[in-house]
């Protein structure tokens, strides 16, 4: 229904701790640089108006849509040129193209220094003096680093760093409380971050027909009792939720997520008997724990699909009298029985048998050419088996750091040109697929895996779409986006590439390397080891063991020395030496 | 061509018990589901126990607590362990594979369960 102040509408829907949350987030996502003091200052422009129309409806100015307000309070920015550069020029247009203009200037990868936790005592410090400043600055800070982060979600991870603080603030060793939970929220917000990212590229590139396929067959998958109807119904809903929060309609979509909740919440006997537990949350915890509710149990007796999707007679007719429906059938019926697939996976297998029939309903015996599909799918599931169990078996063998370093080796054999940072970040954010889904039950292995590496790969593609230096990425990038981790897959040593010069610099090291964390040190390691295979790109397994072992040892010998300085100076030109030998 | 052998059905006094065992040869992937069904002379074939590919297990009621699903994914063998078995039990157990091509069965075995 429509309302006469939208601004208002939203306040009341949300109240004022999660409408100020949420537009802290929206600012901080547009404009990325901008201080939080900036943004908080803008933040409170807007709740005060807010307040005003929710008092009177009909006051001036509450009638404009949110994009206007949001936008004029942005453009009013002092410097905002010389601070945003040509951002500034999306202010001199009209919404919606205004708002069109803010999202493309969006930087997934903006220069800012690594979001750096003060250590506990501070932190307990300036959480019990100001707790809502406190969290402000996790949104704002958050949000300008991940400028796609699912708003929502983002204020549930503010939740728990809220409730960990609480908690560990009290107690007599706050850093050893705080570190391991704090670490934990910060691991599960990143993976969040890529998930997210992800559908987001999906609604950009693909609209919202592709999104509307992925929510299909991932709910068909959590709740396989509900029939098609209620599946669609769930996934017109998630996507209409994700569209608003990919195009920077926070509210909105924090407010159609929370009503998804609730109908979920009211409907549980025909969606899953698995939801009540989450339905017995609060609000942030209840979305946050129906978006990852456990499978429900599949039903026992569901028959083979061939009948309705291969052997019935009128398979061409159904087609094409409502072709999009018919498919999502397909979908909804193949993955509600594979609960063991990824979601890519069963997008492929739906994208191949839209394939067939396109190209069998316009031949003379329809049947005969679409008999085989259902086999013809057997090597599509195979591919992803089968990675999944080499690099689980990899994984079991090196562990985590080993098992990154094996990709990085891989990596930058396929797309030596893309920068070495770019490569140590997919490397080791790769390589962490190992601890999160090899120790998962068998049938939860390949979900996990692959459509984790799909969203790894969609930053890469991200990162590689501002400066591309490899037609090897740029043709796995531009295909669909659930071909893109077979084709990352396929790939091989890029023939095409000049290997670098060997340079002493790149592989001499300091004696600040010692004071290091243990995550820093490694990736210096890594970052000489993808230089090396930039180096000689055909260097077998067994020398660039041998040369990182050695690099090892040298590190461990060097600052364990009682001169670590000299150490350094007069070994590290020999560890470059033998380097060089050992891949000659 | 896939095929199900079953074993393991006999004659056996109530009260005892039985290990039915099925094996597959030939190619099937993508199995989702796997059970095994019983009719017993003059009736409809009833599901006695299925296993899913997700691991649930479901169990007609009037079989529960005595007979145990269970399966062998790197043997593509499924086995039913029929403990405290009844007369009414008695049947030609048949075990059932599906993958979303095709519904693939056994032969049967027949169990009898009589003093």
């Known amino acids: 229904e429509a309302h006469k102040s939208e601004i208002a509408h939203r306040y009341n829907d949300l109240g004022e701790q999660h409408f100020k949350g949420l537009v802290l987030i929206a600012f901080s996502q547009y404009l990325q640089k901008c201080s939080y003091d900036e943004h908080a200052k803008l933040v409170q422009e807007v709740t005060d108006f807010a307040k005003t129309c929710v008092a009177d409806e009909s006051a001036a100015n509450c009638d404009k849509s949110l994009h206007t307000l949001f936008g004029d309070k942005l453009c009013a920015i002092p410097n905002l040129r010389e601070n945003y550069g040509e951002l500034a020029d999306c202010c001199t247009k009209q919404e919606p193209e205004r708002n069109e203009c803010f999202l493309q200037h969006k930087d997934d990868n903006p220069s800012l220094p690594p979001f750096e936790r003060p250590e506990a005592e501070a932190m307990c410090t300036s959480f019990k003096e100001n707790p809502t400043t406190f969290m402000g600055h996790y949104l704002h800070e958050v949000a300008r680093r991940h400028p796609y982060f699912y708003a929502p979600e983002l204020l549930y991870y503010a939740e728990q760093y809220n409730e960990i603080l609480t908690q560990c603030c009290a107690e007599a060793d706050k850093e050893s409380c705080l570190t391991p939970k704090l670490d934990g929220v910060k691991e599960k917000a990143l993976v969040s971050s890529v998930r997210q990212r992800m559908k987001c590229s999906s609604m950009q590139k693909f609209g919202e027909r592709a999104f509307k396929a992925w929510a299909v067959a991932r709910l068909s998958q959590t709740f396989p009792n509900a029939d098609f109807a209620e599946i669609t119904k769930l996934a017109t809903d998630l996507t209409k939720v994700n569209k608003e929060c990919c195009h920077g309609d926070l509210l909105e979509c924090a407010d159609d997520r929370a009503e998804l909740a609730k109908y979920m919440c009211e409907n549980q006997a025909t969606i899953s008997s698995k939801l009540q537990t989450c339905c017995d949350k609060p609000l942030l915890k209840k979305a946050h724990c129906l978006s990852e509710v456990e499978h429900d149990t599949m039903p026992a007796d569901l028959p083979a699909i061939a009948a309705d999707f291969v052997e019935d007679q009128e398979v061409c007719k159904n087609y094409a009298e409502a072709k999009d429906v018919f498919l999502g059938t397909f979908l909804y019926e193949y993955s509600r029985r594979h609960p063991d697939y990824s979601v890519s996976l069963l997008l492929r297998l739906a994208k191949k048998y839209e394939a067939t029939l396109e190209k069998c309903c316009a031949e003379a015996n329809p049947p005969a050419c679409y008999g085989t599909v259902l086999a013809e799918f057997q090597p599509l599931v195979e591919e992803p088996k089968n990675l999944v169990k080499t690099n689980c078996d990899l994984y079991e063998k090196l562990g985590e750091y080993g098992f990154q370093n094996a990709i990085l080796v891989r990596y930058t054999q396929k797309a030596p040109q893309v920068s070495t940072p770019t490569l140590v970040e997919a490397a080791r954010n790769l390589g962490r697929v190992g601890t999160k889904c090899c120790t998962l039950p068998e049938d939860q292995r390949l979900p996990c895996v692959e459509d984790y590496l799909s969203a790894i790969l969609n930053r890469v593609c991200l990162l590689h779409e501002k400066t591309p230096v490899s037609e090897h990425v740029t043709k796995c990038c531009s295909g669909s986006l659930v071909e893109r981790r077979p084709c990352f897959s396929a790939l091989t040593v890029d023939e095409t590439y000049v290997p670098k010069e060997f340079k002493a610099e790149t592989f001499t090291f300091h004696s600040d390397i010692c004071t290091l964390p243990e995550k820093e040190k490694q990736i210096k390691k890594q970052t000489a080891l993808a230089e090396l295979v930039k180096h000689k790109p055909k260097a077998t397994a067994e020398q660039l063991k041998t040369v990182m072992d050695d690099f090892a040892q040298f590190l461990d010998t060097c600052c364990k020395a009682a001169d670590k300085d000299t150490c350094f100076s007069t070994e590290g030109p020999n560890l470059v030496t033998r380097c060089k030998d050992a891949l000659a | 061509q896939v095929q199900l052998v079953e074993s393991g059905g006999g004659l056996v006094q109530p009260g005892g018990s039985l290990r039915l065992s099925c094996s597959a040869s030939g190619s099937i992937w993508g199995i989702y589901h796997m059970g095994w069904y019983r009719q017993a002379p003059g009736k409809q074939r009833e599901l006695v126990a299925s296993?899913?590919?997700?691991?649930?297990?479901h169990y007609a009621d009037t079989v529960k607590g005595r007979f145990t699903i269970s399966r062998d994914n790197s043997k593509n063998t499924l086995y039913l362990q029929m403990n405290s078995l009844e007369p009414e039990d008695t049947a030609v157990y048949y075990c059932?594979?599906?993958?979303?091509?095709?519904?693939?069965w056994g032969q049967g075995t027949q169990v009898t369960v009589s003093s």
């Open positions: 059932d594979i599906r993958n979303v091509g095709g519904d693939y």
């Open positions: 296993i899913t590919v997700d691991g649930s297990t």
